[in-house]
């Protein structure tokens, strides 16, 4: 009979789809995530099973609290799509799908730098490539540790472009790019590239 | 070159056990499922059990309990244990890969071995 | 247990002819198509012809085709060649109780 009933909740609201979610969206190859499968009804004991496509992962029980599956993405296939299923004696639903983006950390970007001099200023050009990563690709200029351009959004592999002008400094200043991409807290830094003072003949990156 | 060869049949005699086996080449076991299906002489075929990928298995009705599956990863091999064997477990069983994720889409199979269970 | 029934358990057909095989599930599969579709040659292993219920596999002819979906499915062989002479058979996938396969019984198809 409790079957008969719990099909017949089913029916109603009172049974509705799990679902299934993820704090991690984006996601690099060999990391771990868990996904949670979760019901509105905290007052059933429920069966959750979590699938692949056409593969099934697992199965747990829980009542009130989601089921946890962890996971290791170590394969492209493994980005989904994901369903699981919320089982209560002989009566089912399924939530809907859910997949993950598997993006490619971000290499060390490198920087260059080129300089035009005149007698008064420096034309400063910075070009930051990072030549491994998923596009798009952030990069961020910063001299003295301190940020001086906009996120410069690339979307093929080509070196971004900041360009500043400078009175001629007294001090030397260093300068390093951020590369980034939809990884969240993964940012790169290239090693930085220090700008001698002007005394004398020296800006080795000067054109002449 | 992707394939499966069975090995482990033969003559049993009924109560006995056999352990049968499925070396896998040309692909891992830790991203592919291999399924045991077996065939009766004039018969249909017949499924077995089941390991995925993550190692999990499942096992028709039928042969829960009398019949168990393993995987040994080093090798790149999967078994088949036969227990408490009978005259109706005389068959020719095959070991089949799955497609990615898809456990019984089933495109990759061996030559099969003929396990005769007769005292 | 789940039941799946094909039917004709044997037909007898002419080169050329359209076959068509059934395959009844007593459950709706996973997914509402997790069949596929397999042929068999005497002392051969099975070769798989359909999957997802409709998908060609990789190799095999256009004049195959499946369709179906839930407990309902049909392969047809839109002109049978004399190769097609062989037993066909359905395999079900399902979750219902416990992550479950079933194959059909088989299905002959002879030379007229």
């Known amino acids: 009979r409790k079957a008969v009933l719990d099909c017949e909740a089913m029916k109603t609201n009172e049974f509705p789809s799990p679902c299934l979610d993820s704090k991690t969206k984006v996601v690099m190859k060999g990391q771990n995530v868990s996904m949670f499968c979760s019901h509105k009804n905290k007052s059933l004991q429920i069966t959750y099973s979590l699938f692949r496509r056409k593969t099934h992962l697992g199965t747990q029980d829980g009542k009130g609290e989601p089921a946890i599956f962890n996971l290791s993405i170590t394969e492209a296939h493994e980005s989904g799509p994901y369903k699981c299923k919320a089982q209560v004696t002989s009566c089912s639903k399924y939530s809907r799908d859910f997949s993950f983006t598997i993006v490619d950390p971000v290499t060390s970007p490198v920087l260059n730098i080129m300089v035009i001099q005149t007698e008064t200023d420096r034309h400063i050009t910075l070009h930051c490539l990072s030549v491994n990563g998923s596009l798009p690709i952030n990069y961020t200029f910063f001299e003295n540790h301190v940020a001086i351009s906009p996120a410069i959004s690339k979307y093929d592999r080509e070196p971004a472009e900041f360009n500043l002008t400078k009175k001629n400094p007294g001090e030397e200043e260093e300068y390093r790019c951020e590369a980034k991409n939809r990884l969240p807290n993964y940012a790169t830094y290239s090693h930085p590239v220090t700008m001698p003072s002007t005394g004398g003949d020296s800006c080795p990156f000067c054109l002449k | 070159e992707v394939q499966l060869v069975e090995s482990g049949g033969g003559l049993v005699q009924p109560g006995g056990s056999l352990r049968l086996s499925c070396a896998a080449s040309?692909?891992?076991?830790?991203?592919?499922?291999i399924t045991w299906v077996r065939q009766a002489p004039g018969k249909c075929l017949e499924w077995i059990g089941t390991i995925n990928s993550y190692g999990n298995t499942y096992y028709s009705t039928w042969a829960k309990g009398r019949f168990t599956i393993s995987r040994d990863n080093s090798k790149n091999t999967v078994y088949l244990q036969m227990n408490s064997l009978r005259a109706e477990d005389t068959a020719v069983y095959y070991c089949a890969r799955g497609y990615v994720d898809s456990d019984w889409y089933l495109n990759i199979w061996g030559q099969g071995t003929l396990v005769t269970v007769s005292s | 247990a789940i039941q799946m029934t094909q039917s004709p358990s044997s037909l007898s057909a002419r080169v050329g002819d359209r076959v068509t095989i059934t395959c009844q599930s007593s459950?709706?599969?996973?997914?509402?198509?997790?069949l596929s579709w397999y042929q068999q040659k005497p002392g051969k292993a099975p070769k798989l012809l359909i999957y997802?219920?409709?998908r060609l596999a990789s190799g095999v002819p256009s004049r195959f085709s499946g369709s179906g979906s839930g407990t309902q499915f049909t392969l047809t062989i839109s002109s049978l060649q004399p190769e097609d002479f062989a037993t066909y058979y359905c395999?079900?996938?399902?979750?219902?109780?416990?992550?479950?396969?079933?194959f059909g019984q088989g299905t002959k198809v002879e030379i007229k």
């Open positions: 040309g692909f891992s076991l830790t991203i592919y499922t």
């Open positions: 395999l079900g996938g399902y979750d219902s109780s416990g992550w479950y396969a079933a």
């Open positions: 997802d219920a409709s």
């Open positions: 459950e709706s599969v996973y997914d509402n198509n997790y």
